[in-house]
Amino acid sequence: KESCDVQLYIKRQSYHSIFAGDPFKLECPVKYCAHRPQVTWCKLNGTTCVKLEGRHTSWKQEKNLSFFILHFEPVLPSDNGSYRCSANFLSAIIESHSTTLYVTDVKSASERPSKDEMASR
């Protein structure tokens, strides 16, 4: 388990309930040993994952883990959907599980739903 393979710790079936108009950071936790791999984000369109170009991304370091962050400034209703990060390491592509953003458009919601309501989706 403690190998020097690159690992991407996005959880299978994970999701985030967020609101349009808010800022949001989508994190891809990356474990690597010597050299930080090149990491990219893509958004699922059916079975195809379309690479996100020209988006604001950044790195954050925490103990023995790095995070490749996709910034939403702000979240748009069209950001609803599933995302995946992938790392290019030693000419191999390592893909994460997908994570889903459930975006509530506050214009169409009279008030923000509770966390319980969001979780029941």
Epitope: D5, V6, Y9, K11, I94
Partner: antibody, heavy 121, light 112 residues
């Protein structure tokens, strides 16, 4: 080495509530799901539900909706299972289990030693 | 819920002999990501469960290679090529493809 520490036993009166804890060492629970599993005496295993400690999102088996509440405290690396309105049917061993995720791999490696809950007047 | 049916209920085996446990699911465990989230666990007497096999056939670290997992779709098998004394306990199949996650009823392996 990853370890999950649970209290050994709890004796609770019918109608009361109880909160069981599971503390992880050797791994940050934010990068995992924490599951709870029930095992009644001389019976099989039942999945109660899970939490994503990174954001508090929970999922429960329909049978345990309303009976079980799973929470997590990332500062203490601890997950909790609260059981309400206890009856003799809730007498069981409750295991916590940690799902460890790497890139598109699935691990369900680590189990606590279990807490024996006895509901009796 | 996906029903996981294990057979046999009890298996009595002589040390050194092979053993086989079947697990059938009420629907296919092939996920949309192309993987099959089927695990095998062993619960030794008085202990918590321990996973032996994940994704149908991948052995956990430290698990002897006398254990093999196979199958696809709805039919899965755990085989032990030569049973040893430490293998006794209850074996469970467990699926994580569909919500809620479900376990088989267990197969008790006894040593003759």
């Amino acid at each position: 080495e990853v370890q999950l520490q649970q209290s050994v036993a709890e004796l609770v009166r019918p109608g009361a509530s109880v909160k069981l804890s599971c503390t992880a060492s050797g791994f940050n629970i934010k990068n995992t799901y924490m599951h709870w599993v029930k095992q009644r005496p001389e019976q099989g295993l039942e999945w109660i539900g899970r939490i994503d400690p990174a954001n508090g999102n929970t999922k429960y088996a329909p049978k345990f909706q309303g009976k079980a509440t799973i929470t997590a405290d990332t500062s203490s690396n601890t997950a909790y299972l609260q059981l309400s309105s206890l009856t003799s049917e809730d007498t069981a061993i409750y295991y916590c289990a940690l799902t460890y995720y790497g890139s598109s791999q699935y691990y369900f490696d680590y189990w606590g030693q279990g807490t024996t809950l006895t509901v009796s007047s | 819920d996906v029903v996981m049916t294990q057979t046999p209920l009890t298996l009595s085996v002589t040390i050194g002999q092979p053993a086989s446990i079947s697990c059938k699911s009420s629907q296919s465990l092939l996920d949309s990501d192309g993987k099959t989230y089927l695990n095998w666990l062993l619960q030794r007497p008085g202990q918590s469960p321990k996973r032996l096999i994940y994704l149908v056939s991948k052995l956990d670290s430290g698990v002897p290679d006398r254990f093999t997992g196979s199958g696809s779709g709805t039919d899965f098998t755990l085989k032990i090529s030569r049973v040893e004394a430490e293998d006794l306990g209850v074996y469970y199949c467990w699926q994580g493809t569909h919500f809620p996650q479900t376990f088989g009823g267990g197969t008790k392996l006894e040593i003759k």
